[in-house]
């Protein structure tokens, strides 16, 4: 049935980039200006997407395709198809209901977004801390105490408070 | 479009091993926190373990501490979550999911199912 | 340990509002994310940032957070949402989860 219904529909024969006019005796029509058909067979063409405000435009429209939009710098995009930015914070920082906050202690942000997360509790593996944690960093576990030669040493911080219902490792 | 592929889940004995695993595909895995959450039968979701983008950072649930291990392999965008000394309350479904923090996990996998009995 | 509390069980009629609601210490201080698992599937995020809709998920859902309770509303809930509702949030970097909340589209 579906078949003979597409034979018989001269709509099927419309490519993409056009739409089947039905004030035309359903002809072909290319998309007007600022308008696209990413399929065959459309009986209109789509609204082109303007990438206005914070929103920058990463590919234009075209008869066959919809703009496609990122961010202006300082945001970054939010959502499929990127329908909404959202404010970078600095490395060290997350994205609080009021704004940027710097990590508390014992955790690390080394992105522009997400959120902070614990250092990695070197401990909990057996091994030493080599380098100390900051807020943009994590710590760098190096071998456990036992494996270090005589007259090497390794940074020993303040031990983070442990995370409530999870063990960082 | 991005896309988790679980496999690994099986039938197993109590005390047994297993090792699930995780296929991603179209979006920056290197860059992204991974998570494992699982759901026992008719219950609730319950987050197990999170890593970090370079794989050098795991963090789990207190109670499954030294039997599960979570990892990654970012040059095949697959993570995994070996589970050892499987006990009968292990037996859930398991999710893998893209932890965006403040976006939520906002992909998950379509489950892999694990039961414990002898 | 942080925890969330949901109501096991929410009924509604067919086009009547739904509201789920998700209790935790200091919840408004923090992100809260909601989850729809339809029987036998994958959960799927609804609503992200107490309140944001992501691509996709229909406008009669949406979000709020104030003081200890966040709250999921389904504006004329139709069949096909009935499902079980998660609540989330994170605790020094671990996604939490409430227990969930059963709808019913009676």
């Known amino acids: 049935f579906e078949r003979t219904r597409s034979l018989q529909d001269p709509c099927s024969n419309c490519p993409a980039g056009t739409f089947c006019d039905n004030n035309r005796n359903q002809i072909c029509s290319p998309c007007p200006p600022n308008s696209f058909s990413s399929a065959g067979g459309q009986r209109t063409c789509d609204i082109c997407r303007q990438c206005k405000g914070v929103f920058r435009t990463r590919k234009e429209c075209s008869s066959t395709s919809n703009a496609e939009c990122d961010c202006t710098p300082g945001f970054h995009c939010l959502g499929a198809g990127c329908s909404m930015c959202e404010q970078d914070c600095k490395q060290g920082q997350e994205l609080t209901k009021k704004g940027c906050k710097d990590c508390c202690f014992g955790t690390f942000n080394d992105q522009k977004r997400g959120i902070c997360r614990p250092w990695t509790n070197c401990s909990l593996d057996g091994k030493s801390v080599l380098v100390n944690g900051t807020k943009e960093r994590d710590v760098v576990c190096g071998p456990s105490p036992a494996d270090l030669s005589p007259g090497a040493s390794s940074v020993t911080p303040p031990a983070p408070a442990r995370e409530p219902g999870h063990s960082p490792q | 479009q991005v896309q988790l592929v679980q496999s690994g889940g099986d039938l197993v004995q109590p005390g047994g091993s297993l090792r699930l695993s995780c296929a991603a595909s179209g979006f920056l895995f290197s860059n992204s926190w991974m998570t494992w959450v699982r759901q026992a039968p008719g219950k609730g979701l319950e987050w197990l373990a999170n890593?970090?983008?370079?794989?050098?950072?795991?963090y789990y649930v207190d109670s499954l501490r030294g039997r599960f291990t979570i990892s990654r392999d970012n040059a095949k965008n697959s993570l995994y979550l070996q589970m050892n000394s499987l006990r009968v309350e292990d037996t859930a479904m398991y999710y893998c999911a893209r932890d965006r923090g403040n976006d939520g996990l906002d992909y998950w996998g379509q489950g892999t199912l694990v039961t414990v009995s002898s | 340990s942080y925890e969330l509390t949901q109501p096991p069980s929410v009924s509604v009629s067919p086009g009547q509002t739904a509201r789920i609601t998700c209790s935790g210490e200091k919840l408004d201080d923090k992100y809260t994310f909601w989850y729809q698992q339809r029987t036998g599937q994958t959960p799927v995020l609804v609503i992200y940032q107490d309140k944001k809709r992501p691509s996709g998920i229909p406008e009669r859902f949406s979000g709020s957070n104030s003081g200890n309770t966040a709250t999921l509303t389904i504006s004329g809930t139709q069949a096909v949402d009935e499902a079980d509702y998660y609540c989330?949030?994170?605790?020094?970097?671990?996604?939490?989860f409430g227990g969930g909340t059963k709808l019913t589209v009676l």
């Open positions: 989330q949030t994170y605790d020094s970097g671990a996604p939490v």
């Open positions: 890593i970090k983008p370079d794989g050098s950072g795991q």
